[in-house]
């Protein structure tokens, strides 16, 4: 098992850009400061499943 | 199916104390946040409070700040919304929703994709 | 906290239509905006994210852009469906914040 992340609670904080290192099924909510469940997209068209990239369009799609 | 359930609205006096419950089914809260957003009659939406069931963070709007606890419990998978020193202008459809995230360059793209049908709190003598 | 400033409050409109609402934040949010639909005793629901990206089942005459401070929906030829009122919120930095809401009604 891999080291635990440390989980700092800093509510309101302007500091949002720097994201925590998160786990594979994990990405950072700037909204709550913590990282949180992330869904993958999948292309309708071809079924691809990835990260989100800004200018395509994409389907949201349960992550595993 | 993603479904959330709200309960425990009704007329309270002013002073009094509500619990609403948000129920949720067909994914589990403890690692999305949940969210508490109100309308009172005739207005727009306003954000109360969320949750992130994981690790306990919470945060209020200033209106409610010091009256409202949010809660969750992960083994009933149910948030909760402990409403005390309740004012008339608290009067609202109160709902509850969950904040979905997409994984963008490992941050959220997000919104509240799910919620619930709402529940009328009235504070009234 | 950010506010989020949206306009007009309430627009008249047509079938066919081209329809864009505008919202202004206080400060930067980067592309931290949702987009809502409303309509009367029913709960919001979600149209855009990310301020440009279309959420599933979601119309593809509804479109979202913009990133900093100012955004905007745009609904490309509005149907009958489409008369409700809609929100802009912010989830860049806690809390959250709607916009003041758009209605938009039959000409």
């Known amino acids: 098992m891999g080291a635990r992340r440390l989980r700092v609670r800093s509510q309101r904080s302007r500091d949002s850009s720097v994201p925590t290192q998160c786990n594979q099924t994990e990405c950072f909510d700037p909204l709550v400061r913590n990282c949180v469940s992330c869904e993958l997209f999948h292309t309708p068209d071809t079924g691809h499943t990835s990260s989100l990239e800004p200018g395509t369009a994409l389907q949201p799609q349960e992550g595993s | 199916e993603v479904q959330l359930v709200e309960s425990g609205g009704g007329l309270v006096q002013p002073g009094g104390s509500l619990r609403l419950s948000c129920a949720a089914s067909g994914f589990t809260i403890a690692s999305s946040s949940i969210h508490w957003v109100r309308q009172a009659p005739g207005k727009g939406l306003e954000w109360v409070a969320w949750?992130?069931?994981?690790?306990?963070?919470?945060d209020y709007a200033d209106s409610v700040k010091g009256r409202f606890t949010i809660s969750a419990d992960t083994s009933k998978n149910t948030a909760y919304l402990q409403m005390n020193s309740l004012r008339a202008e608290d009067t609202a459809v109160y709902y509850c929703a969950r904040r979905v995230c997409y994984n963008r360059l490992g941050v959220c793209a997000g919104g509240m994709d799910y919620w619930g049908q709402g529940t009328l709190v009235t504070v009234s003598s | 906290d950010i506010q989020m400033t949206q306009s007009p409050s309430s627009l008249s409109a047509s079938v066919g239509d081209r329809v864009t609402i505008t919202c202004r934040a206080s400060e930067d949010i980067s592309s931290a905006v949702a987009w809502y639909q409303q309509k009367p005793g029913k709960a919001p629901k979600l149209l855009i994210f990310?301020?440009?990206f279309l959420y599933s089942g979601v119309p593809s005459r509804f479109s979202g852009s913009g990133s900093g401070t100012d955004f905007t929906l745009t609904i490309s030829s509005l149907q009958p469906e489409d008369f409700a009122t809609y929100y802009c919120q912010q989830s860049q930095i806690s809390p959250p914040t709607f916009g003041q809401g758009t209605k938009v009604e039959i000409k």
């Open positions: 990310a301020a440009s």
């Open positions: 949750v992130l069931p994981s690790v306990g963070f919470t």
